[in-house]
Interface confidence: medium
Amino acid sequence: FERTRSLQDPCSNCPAGTFCDNNRNQICSPCPPNSFSSAGGQRTCDICRQCKGVFRTRKECSSTSNAECDCTPGFHCLGAGCSMCEQDCKQGQELTKKGCKDCCFGTFNDQKRGICRPWTNCSLDGKSVLVNGTKERDVVCGPSPADLSPGASSVTPPAPAREPGHSPQ
């Protein structure tokens, strides 16, 4: 079948990195500079992606594969094939429609990306709050109040309306 097809269509013999040139009697011509063909039998070569602005080149374009981009420091990739670069935020922040915003009360983010997550609700596991949470750090849960020896103290958890876990995720 392959041989029959190649007799019918000379373009099927053109390997990746070339294109079937109709202007030159359907002979296989190398892809011009800044273009590529990743499969055989193509009648045109695709233009290489150019990594400009906040994009930087992660992998150079070759005659058989497209360039790959990532983002400059302070930005990170979003979308398939790094189609967008978005700014990093600071710890204790998250990216919103209006840019980087501090985590709301009751939530934290210990990374430069990701979203603000709710503080762990220690009471759900019958434990007490040993160390209060911040915008950058989760609460640390300690032993249950009953396990604490007399005189031992534990940080008082926030009031019920502001209980850890009652804030945006």
Partner: antibody, heavy 121, light 110 residues
Framework: QVQLVQSGAEVKKPGASVKVSCKAS????????MHWVRQAPGQGPEWMGV????????TYAQKFQGRLTVTRDTSSSTVYMELSSLRSEDTAVYYC??????????????WGQGTTVTVSS | SSELTQDPAVSVALGQTVRITCQGD??????ASWYQQKPGQAPRLLIY???IRPSGIPDRFSGTDSGNTDFLTITGAQAEDEADYYC?????????????FGGGTKLTVL
């Protein structure tokens, strides 16, 4: 590929409890938070709660606090949702759904097939 | 607690463009995620963030926003797009819940 496989349908009497399992495969179980969402017949989805499989920390919707318990078993990559004191209005399809924040943006990208829970006397 | 509001039903002629809306206070801060659900199936994520599609989602689905409203646009609706569509976002309310869903929009393709 990434998959969430839930336990089978349940029929329960009012006042009873139900425990639904959700087994994850195809990714690092502890790296993604897991939500539970239910959907009553003819209604939209309703968020119930979330667990961080890494720490076991949970957060529940106010509506379900006191009745809902979400746990996980890291050795089997399974999350469990237990709902107690069942009433007829708890009749719904219960879904587990993986939380993928895609660096900055929230979305539930993989869902279990759903477990039908019927509460009837 | 805040809510996400959707039109209950929308119809579109085959091949035409339709826009489904989702309104809520939390959308001033966060982008909505959009899900498609067909009868007997689990919801499927279509759009998240600033108009980002997971792999396998056709490019006729797109997301935009304005103020406290996010939009799902289907350009060139196909028969297989007939389904329920739900928006979803995180909540900015200091109380529960942490995750919100809209009531859903039933799309009919004529």
């Amino acid at each position: 590929q990434v998959q969430l496989v839930q336990s089978g349908a349940e029929v329960k009497k009012p006042g009873a409890s139900v425990k639904v399992s959700c087994k994850a495969s195809g990714y690092t179980f502890t790296s993604k938070w897991m939500h539970w969402v239910r959907q009553a017949p003819g209604q939209g989805p309703e968020w119930m709660g979330v667990i961080n499989p890494s720490s076991g920390g949970t957060t529940y919707a106010q509506k379900f606090q006191g009745r809902l318990t979400v746990t996980r078993d890291t050795s089997s990559s399974t999350v469990y949702m237990e709902l107690s004191s069942l009433r007829s209005e708890d009749t719904a399809v219960y879904y587990c759904a993986r939380d993928d924040v895609f660096d900055y943006y929230f979305g539930l990208d993989v869902w279990g097939q759903g477990t039908t829970v019927t509460v009837s006397s | 607690s805040s809510e996400l509001t959707q039109d209950p039903a929308v119809s579109v002629a085959l091949g035409q463009t339709v826009r489904i809306t989702c309104q809520g206070d939390s959308l001033r801060r966060y982008y909505a995620s959009w899900y498609q659900q067909k009868p007997g199936q689990a919801p499927r994520l279509l759009i998240y963030g600033k108009n980002i599609r997971p792999s396998g989602i056709p490019d006729r689905f797109s997301g935009t926003d304005s103020g406290n409203t996010d939009f799902l646009t289907i350009t060139g609706a196909q028969a297989e797009d007939e389904a329920d569509y739900y928006c979803n976002s995180r909540d900015t309310d200091a109380n529960q819940p942490l995750v919100l869903f809209g009531g859903g929009t039933k799309l009919t393709v004529l």
